[in-house]
Interface confidence: medium
């Protein structure tokens, strides 16, 4: 398989609601019609798959119904959003892109986006 460059931001801070968004951009060497995007989380040298979607160029990304990810595509960019994050989910989130069809097959893996998640402070009790 052929290597392909994938770019993603180095650092992203999740919102107070536990939502983090980042762009994954790949340098497509050809006109792919079928693309697969996988988000991997690396923490303590362990790599786990967070979510994945296969899409046809020009169509929306479709993640599984119970996925914590959503996304949109525009050309060679994929806008990924991960929801429901908590402080314990802080880690390096790696974007993996595969150009599935037509052949040849290309594989690209980004350097990862460090997502920092800070659990919101509980609201203090109010007298009012």
């Amino acid at each position: 398989c052929k290597a392909m460059h994938v770019a993603q931001p180095a650092v992203v801070l999740a919102s107070s609601r536990g939502i983090a968004s980042f762009v994954c951009e790949y340098a497509s060497p050809g006109k792919a019609t079928e693309v697969r995007v996988t988000v991997l989380r690396q923490a303590d040298s362990q790599v786990t798959e967070v979510c994945a979607a296969t899409y046809m160029m020009g169509n929306e990304l479709t993640f599984l119904d119970d996925s914590i990810c959503t996304g949109t595509s525009s050309g060679n960019q994929v806008n990924l959003t991960i929801q429901g994050l908590r402080a314990m989910d802080t880690g390096l989130y790696i974007c993996k892109v595969e150009l599935m069809y037509p052949p040849p097959y290309y594989l690209g893996i980004g350097n990862g986006t460090q997502i920092y998640v800070i659990d919101p402070e509980p609201c203090p009790d109010s007298d009012f």
Epitope: E34, R36, T54, M56, M100, Y101, P102, P103, P104, Y105
Partner: antibody, heavy 121, light 107 residues
């Protein structure tokens, strides 16, 4: 061990229909990283790619010669691949092979034994 | 569509001979070419992919080379079980097409 076993071939009249099956074992048809497809070989002739279906999704692809007449599908629960052949013509007479197509190589690494489809009146 | 032309269409050789089959693509396919062996009444068997990568379990007497439009399959020392028909197939764009085949017969 990877195995592919085709069935469903036979004699059919021009304009008729047939459904070919390919039972897979030793790997999952829905596994990412591999597609599966059909290749045919007319008697005494060479090989012709017919159709393929992706492993991750269910994206389908066809050769122009069969587009609109043939339909590829799979049943993940049965780990079986199908090819529905409609509006058959004499030139569709061939041995139909199902084969596995790893994306990393895009070459057919495992083949079934083939099933003969004869279109004749 | 990319056309693949194999030469020769057939050849006669003896056990122990060095055999070379060529495959020419109508346009460049980089190194995205595979070779198959087919014996009568049997399914094809993958020998080489990506022009020169030997498929697991295939004897080392088989080798492939080439890039762009011109490719070669070489059998360094022909064995009795090698008498068969050989096909090339590109994997660069679609449709995936095959060469017309080269039949290797016993001299």
């Amino acid at each position: 061990e990877v195995q592919l076993v085709e069935s469903g071939g036979g004699l059919v009249q021009p304009g008729g229909s047939l459904r070919l099956s390919c039972a897979a074992s030793g790997f999952s048809l829905s596994t990412g990283g591999v597609a599966v497809g059909w290749i045919r070989q007319a008697p005494g002739k060479g090989l012709e790619w017919v159709s393929a279906i992706s492993g991750y999704g269910s994206t389908t692809y066809y050769a122009d010669s069969v587009k609109g007449r043939f339909t590829i599908s799979r049943d993940n629960s049965k780990n079986t691949l199908y090819l529905q052949l409609n509006s058959l013509r004499a030139e569709d007479t061939a041995v139909y092979y199902c084969a596995r197509l790893p994306y990393s190589a895009y070459a057919f690494d495992y083949w079934g034994q083939g099933t003969l489809v004869t279109v004749s009146s | 569509d990319i056309q693949l032309t194999q030469s020769p269409s057939s050849l006669s050789a003896s056990v122990g001979d060095r055999v070379t089959i060529t495959c020419r693509a109508s346009q460049g396919v980089s190194s995205y070419l595979a070779w198959y062996q087919q014996k009568p009444g049997k399914a094809p068997k993958l020998l080489i992919y990506a022009a020169s990568t030997l498929q697991s379990g295939v004897p080392s007497r088989f080798s492939g080379s080439g890039s762009g439009t011109d490719f070669t399959l070489t059998i360094s020392s022909l064995q009795p079980e090698d008498f068969a028909t050989y096909y090339c197939q590109h994997h660069y764009g679609t449709p995936l097409t095959f060469g017309q085949g080269t039949k290797v017969e016993i001299k």
